[in-house]
């Protein structure tokens, strides 16, 4: 994401087209309060960050309100007046969709349809992962809308489910992030359960696709 300039590595995350988080890791300036300056238009003056992230008492990032901005973010990370990293990036390439909301399960014999609220923008994949205590791996199915039907389930088994949203790489490029997973829900015989016996703890979702 952010090549190194003067040993500065950056990460950009655009949370659900609402908030941009830019974080930096600069070993050379580890005990320095670097400042973050930005603009959304190439012709404007730079503004300074008003919402810094801190790590061990020093600035390590900035949170920006950028609701539905279709812009390039121009930014400069500075040590005093000296720029240590300057770049411009289309924010949308670093999209992280929000976690699925209003997840519902509709059972019909050996199949379940998982639905949730579609996000307001498109070119996304809605992924459902599921497993029973007898499965060694999570199974996965994804669709273009949050309406995913999984067939061939065993009605007697207990299944754990969770859902996430991913940006299509073909459209957004390779640098996006999948959403956080929804809460795990457990079902058996069409009824919700507190847990599935002997289900291993679900692995943490990876950031890479």
């Amino acid at each position: 994401q952010g090549g190194a300039a003067e040993g500065v590595q950056i990460q950009i995350i655009y949370f659900n087209l609402e908030t941009v988080q830019v974080t930096w890791n600069a070993s050379k300036y580890s005990r320095t309060n670097l400042t973050f300056h930005y603009r959304f238009n190439g012709d404007e003056a730079y503004d300074q960050c008003t919402n810094y992230l801190l790590q061990e008492g020093h600035t390590s990032g900035c949170l920006l309100d950028a609701e539905q901005r279709d812009d390039i973010l121009y930014f400069s990370i500075r040590n005093g007046t000296h720029p240590v990293f300057t770049a411009s990036r289309w924010m949308v390439y670093y999209l992280k969709p929000s976690s699925p909301k209003h997840v519902r399960f509709s059972w019909h014999q050996d199949a379940v349809t998982v639905t949730c609220s579609d996000l307001s923008y498109g070119d996304l994949l809605y992924e459902v992962q599921y497993r029973s205590p007898f499965d060694t791996e999570w199974q996965s199915k994804q669709e273009n809308t949050c309406n995913v039907t999984i067939e061939g389930l065993d009605a007697e088994k207990c299944y754990s489910f969770w859902v996430r949203v991913k940006a299509m790489e073909d459209v957004y490029g390779p640098d996006t992030y999948p959403s956080d997973w929804s809460e795990v829900t457990c079902w058996q015989r069409g009824e919700i359960r507190d847990a599935c016996a002997e289900t291993p703890t679900p692995p943490k979702p990876k950031l890479s696709k």
Partner: antibody, heavy 125, light 106 residues
Framework: QVQLVESGGGVVQPGRSLRLSCAAS????????MHWVRQTPGKGLEWVAV????????YYADSVKGRFTISRDNSKNTLYLQMNSLRAEDTAVYYC??????????????????WGQGTMVTVSS | EIVMTQSPATLSVSPGERATLSCRAS??????LGWYQQKPGQAPRLLIY???TRATGIPARFSGSGSGTEFILTISSLQSEDFAVYYC????????FGQGTKVDIK
């Protein structure tokens, strides 16, 4: 079929103005970002300007900023480039081109999948 | 500003042979890179986007690879209609083209 047709090119003196048009057909024009790209023998292909689907955002190459204005009329499926204060270095074939990604609630800059045939602009005294 | 550098400027290849074209970015453009083909008197034609995905209708003999700063366009077996100028273009920041590689008949 999907098509872009440029018009409005010609020979013009330095300092004068010219307006290029690009007529689109065969696709939902109002759902795509549209670009102007020019090609000179000396500089090859150079991106000039973009206007997003709804006209909210426009971007320009530094070489034309303040002199060129991109606009569009979605009701007429037409893209425009108003070129003022023309210079000899603006001499080029001008192409309009379509951004590959159809807008579905968010603009995603991409490659150009459809191009017009180009219109020649010559700036000479 | 990102600078895109293509090499070689001219590549002389016999029909049926393999052609390898290089494109280098002055800073990382991730995989946000396209390749175009242009024949004399015609507009550029999109071949590859996302560094490696073939555009609609593009033959399988065209393939792209690379990410970051180094990219390759390979034409596995040159046909007579493939002799043309090829341009790379980054779309990670703005839209910057390379200066082109001319593929001509050896």
């Amino acid at each position: 079929q999907v098509q872009l047709v440029e018009s409005g090119g010609g020979v013009v003196q330095p300092g004068r103005s010219l307006r290029l048009s690009c007529a689109a057909s065969g696709f939902t024009f109002s759902s795509y970002g549209m670009h102007w790209v020019r090609q000179t023998p000396g500089k090859g292909l150079e991106w000039v300007a973009v206007m997003w689907y709804d006209g909210r955002n426009k971007y320009y190459a530094d070489s034309v900023k303040g002199r060129f204005t991109i606009s569009r009329d979605n009701s007429k499926n037409t893209l425009y480039l108003q070129m003022n204060s023309l210079r000899a270095e603006d001499t080029a074939v001008y192409y309009c081109a379509r951004d590959r990604i159809m807008v579905r609630g968010v603009i995603i800059p991409h490659v150009f999948d459809i191009w017009g045939q180009g219109t020649m602009v010559t700036v000479s005294s | 500003e990102i600078v895109m550098t293509q090499s070689p400027a001219t590549l002389s290849v016999s029909p049926g042979e393999r052609a390898t074209l290089s494109c280098r970015a002055s800073q990382s453009v991730s995989s946000n890179l396209g390749w175009y083909q242009q024949k004399p008197g015609q507009a550029p034609r999109l071949l590859i986007y996302g560094a490696s995905t073939r555009a609609t209708g593009i033959p399988a003999r065209f393939s792209g690879s690379g990410s970051g700063t180094e990219f390759i366009l390979t034409i596995s077996s040159l046909q007579s209609e493939d002799f043309a100028v090829y341009y790379c273009q980054e779309y990670n920041n703005w839209w910057t083209f390379g200066q082109g590689t001319k593929v001509d008949i050896k």
